[in-house]
């Protein structure tokens, strides 16, 4: 069981600093950009992390929504990332949903973040490079040390 | 709990392949990975490399990436790992071992070699 | 590679005595370190991974601590059974790679 807390507004960078954004085609993708990129790319750039109460505590369970035209909520639906056109629900009944990520700080470094997802233990987020695009993937990870799979999550408000 | 049993000791000579097997007894759940590690006489461990069961992917040390492969059949829980071209340097203990998750208080999680198997000694000589 | 550099390679100490093993990282490897124990003629048995989590069952003589670059295992009170060789493993990225193992002897 998951239930909804409070929002907060993020830009979510790579290790490479490279910006999230939703593009056109609401496709998530990395792209380098200046902090005034960034403001002018708005609301592209600025996601909704919303946080969820965890019946089981396995971390902090989030959302990650972004609001163009309409709202849009991220999920790894068969282990594919793509964003949904539904707002964060304010309850999830299930231990396991495929819009919950666990957001957890790499050790010892609090400004890094790992996103786990709830549906599919070991997937998480990471950033891979596709011919010339920089792609928001699930990523099957055993390699917990891998620079692909940490963010940094800038709060906006 | 867990138990890996390997298969029996290997006297081989130079040049030739050895295939050793790692079956899986007792309830595993899914998300492992399979590992190697060899140990020369009165050496340290070496990683060699690991095989995903879930899609047969592998990482191999560089040291071994031309001569080893690593597979695993899923219908009997058993991984393989084949070495080629053996030489007298070669001669080790070879162990089967299990990579899975296990987590902290918060859910963090940290990959762990926990059960292993008992070892299968491979001898080369000539 | 990661390159670790366990020390010492050999320990002599006594029964109740306090021993400390280290492992020095050429790089941040974020606590993902394991200890393991191993005994003649037996596979290595887990001892603490994420650098200071006690394994189940795992006398709590034994612990870890460190974070970055630098990891320590320590015995506060060293038992007769406790001898034997110890590694420790990174496992932050890929090649894995192990010390170079501390060889411990009960005086």
């Known amino acids: 069981y998951f239930g909804k807390l409070e929002s907060k507004l993020s830009v979510i960078r790579n290790l490479n600093d490279q910006v999230l954004f939703i593009d056109q085609g609401n496709r998530p993708l990395f792209e380098d950009m200046t902090d005034s990129d960034c403001r002018d790319n708005a609301p592209r750039t600025i996601f909704i992390i919303s946080m969820y109460k965890d019946s089981q505590p396995r971390g902090m369970a989030v959302t990650i929504s972004v609001k163009c035209e309409k709202i849009s909520t991220l999920s790894c639906e068969n282990k594919i990332i793509s964003f949904k056109e539904m707002n964060p629900p304010d309850n999830i009944k299930d231990t396991k949903s495929d819009i919950i990520f666990f957001q957890r700080s790499v050790p010892g470094h609090d400004n890094k973040m790992q996103f786990e997802s709830s549906s599919y233990e070991g997937y998480f987020l990471a950033c891979e490079k596709e011919r010339d695009l920089f792609k928001l993937i699930l990523k099957k990870e055993d390699e917990l040390g891998d620079r692909s799979i940490m963010f940094t999550v800038q709060n906006e408000d | 709990q867990v138990q890996l049993v390997q298969s029996g000791a290997e006297v081989k000579k130079p040049g030739a392949s050895v295939k050793v097997s790692c079956k899986v007894s007792g309830e595993i759940s899914t998300g492992y990975y399979f590992h190697w590690v060899r140990q020369a006489p009165g050496k340290g461990l070496e990683w060699m490399g690991r095989i995903d069961p879930e899609d047969d992917s592998t990482k191999y040390a560089e040291r071994f990436k031309d001569r080893v492969t690593m597979t695993e059949d899923t219908s009997t829980d058993t991984a393989y790992m084949e070495l080629s071209s053996l030489r007298s340097e070669d001669t080790a203990v070879y162990y089967c071992?299990?990579?899975?998750?296990?987590?902290?208080?918060?859910?963090?999680?940290?990959?762990?070699?926990?059960?292993w198997g008992q070892g299968t000694l491979v001898t080369v000589s000539s | 590679d990661i390159q670790m550099t366990q020390s010492p390679s050999s320990v002599s100490a006594s029964v109740g005595d306090r021993v400390t093993i280290t492992c020095l990282a050429s790089?941040?490897?974020?606590?993902?370190l394991t200890w393991y124990q191993q005994k003649p003629g037996k596979a290595p048995q887990l001892l603490i991974y994420g650098a200071n989590k006690l394994q189940d069952g795992v006398p709590s003589r034994f612990s870890g601590s460190g974070s970055g670059t630098d990891y320590t295992l320590t015995i506060s009170s060293l038992q007769p059974e406790d001898e034997g060789d110890y590694y420790c493993?990174?496992?932050?990225?890929?090649?894995?790679?192990f010390g170079q193992g501390t060889k411990l002897e009960i005086k």
């Open positions: 790089e941040d490897i974020y606590t993902y």
């Open positions: 493993l990174q496992g932050s990225k890929f090649p894995l790679t």
């Open positions: 071992t299990t990579w899975r998750i296990y987590r902290d208080s918060s859910g963090r999680p940290f990959y762990v070699m926990d059960a």
